[in-house]
């Protein structure tokens, strides 16, 4: 069984995540807290990184410019990152593009993807 200190660390990590992902603020039973936090946090950070990269790659977000940038966004960085990025883009490319075109912030886009929103029930 994990020590109380371990859960304290997990909660501290969760509070850090909340700063960029406020919907992580809900807290559930100790047993599934850390796993879910790590899982949500990882997907959410991947999303933020990709969206921020895409924003830097285009002067003005349009369907055309973001679509073009999306084909190159995973090409930079380590091969493991490229795999994670490509997997994310396969699932969410169209929606990320729509969010960017509409002028949503990276945080809004990643939250709208429900990457950090447990829609019902505890974490």
């Amino acid at each position: 069984r994990l020590s109380p200190e371990y859960y304290d660390l997990a909660r501290a990590h969760l509070r850090d995540e909340e700063k960029s992902c406020p919907c992580l603020a809900q807290e559930g039973p100790q047993g599934d807290l850390l796993t879910k936090t790590q899982e949500l946090g990882r997907d959410y950070r991947t999303c933020l990184t990709i969206v921020q990269k895409l924003k830097k790659m285009v002067d003005k977000p349009t369907q055309r410019s973001v679509s073009n940038a999306a084909t190159r966004v995973c090409a930079t960085g380590a091969s493991r990152w490229a795999d994670v990025c490509a997997n994310f883009m396969r699932r969410y490319q169209s929606r990320v593009t729509q969010g960017l075109v509409a002028g949503e912030t990276a945080q809004q886009i990643c939250e709208d993807l429900r990457l950090c929103i447990p829609s019902t029930g505890p974490l």
Epitope: T62, Q63, R64, S94, T97, G99, A102, G103
Partner: antibody, heavy 123, light 111 residues
Framework: QVKLQQSGAEQARPGASVKMSCKAS????????MHWVKQRPGQGLEWIGF????????DYNQKFKARTTLTADKSSTTAYIQLSSLTSEDSAVYYC????????????????WGQGTTVTVSS | DIELTQSPASLAVSLGQRATISCRAS??????????MHWYQQKPGQPPKLLIY???NLESGIPARFSGSGSGTDFTLNIHPVEEEDAATYYC?????????FGGGTKLELK
């Protein structure tokens, strides 16, 4: 039901400014961007730009950027367009129209339009 | 800017016949296998009304006699059979590039 109610006709002198409003009801204001379109008498349609009420992001057609300001007030679910340094070329009907941020919110196009506000510029 | 050229500028069609309106874009308006081209109908003194979105999707409440097709740079709006209430001006519009642009319009009259 969805309604975009625009303010009444405006009469203005050359060089003056006008501010028109578009009151949205019947849907979640922050899930749609608000676009503005100009139509001169007997002419076609010209896209002016849009505002995202959620993030405050604006995108303008370069042709209108210098003298146009788009704003939105989330609390009153109202979008505004201000035209400054008016000339006779600004005499037209101005429409507001909503456009979903994400395609799963509705048809990915300008699906509802206001009735239009007529602006007449003359000395 | 992406220029949209509509043809014809006007057409007269008999009741029950087919009306075909073309819209050609100066460059492709496709991405992710989708075409970002839309069609609107406008009657005098009224705002435009969405008929077709993303090239071929019929807007809710629009009669099935309206249909859209095409991809890339060439798009078509078909109305069949034409009814009296279809007399109006029709516009295509793209949301692929910035700024969004409209075609010059096609005025449909009944013979």
């Amino acid at each position: 039901q969805v309604k975009l109610q625009q303010s009444g006709a405006e009469q203005a002198r050359p060089g003056a400014s006008v501010k028109m409003s578009c009151k949205a009801s019947g849907y979640t204001f922050t899930k749609y961007t608000m676009h503005w379109v100009k139509q001169r008498p007997g002419q076609g349609l010209e896209w002016i730009g849009f505002i995202n009420p959620n993030s405050g992001y604006t995108d303008y057609n370069q042709k209108f950027k210098a003298r146009t300001t788009l704003t939105a007030d989330k609390s009153s679910t109202t979008a505004y367009i201000q035209l400054s340094s008016l000339t006779s070329e600004d005499s037209a009907v101005y429409y507001c129209a909503r456009y979903p941020i994400y395609s799963d919110y509705g048809p990915y196009a300008m699906d509802y339009w206001g009735q239009g506000t007529t602006v007449t510029v003359s000395s | 800017d992406i220029e949209l050229t509509q043809s014809p500028a006007s057409l007269a069609v008999s009741l029950g016949q087919r009306a075909t309106i073309s819209c050609r874009a100066s460059e492709s308006v496709d991405s992710y296998g989708d075409s970002f081209m839309h069609w609107y109908q406008q009657k005098p003194g009224q705002p435009p009304k969405l008929l077709i979105y993303r090239a071929s999707n019929l807007e809710s409440g629009i009669p099935a006699r309206f249909s859209g097709s095409g991809s890339g740079t060439d798009f078509t709006l078909n109305i069949h059979p034409v009814e009296e209430e279809d007399a109006a001006t029709y516009y295509c519009q793209q949301s692929h590039g910035d700024p969004y642009t409209f075609g010059g319009g096609t005025k449909l009259e009944l013979k």
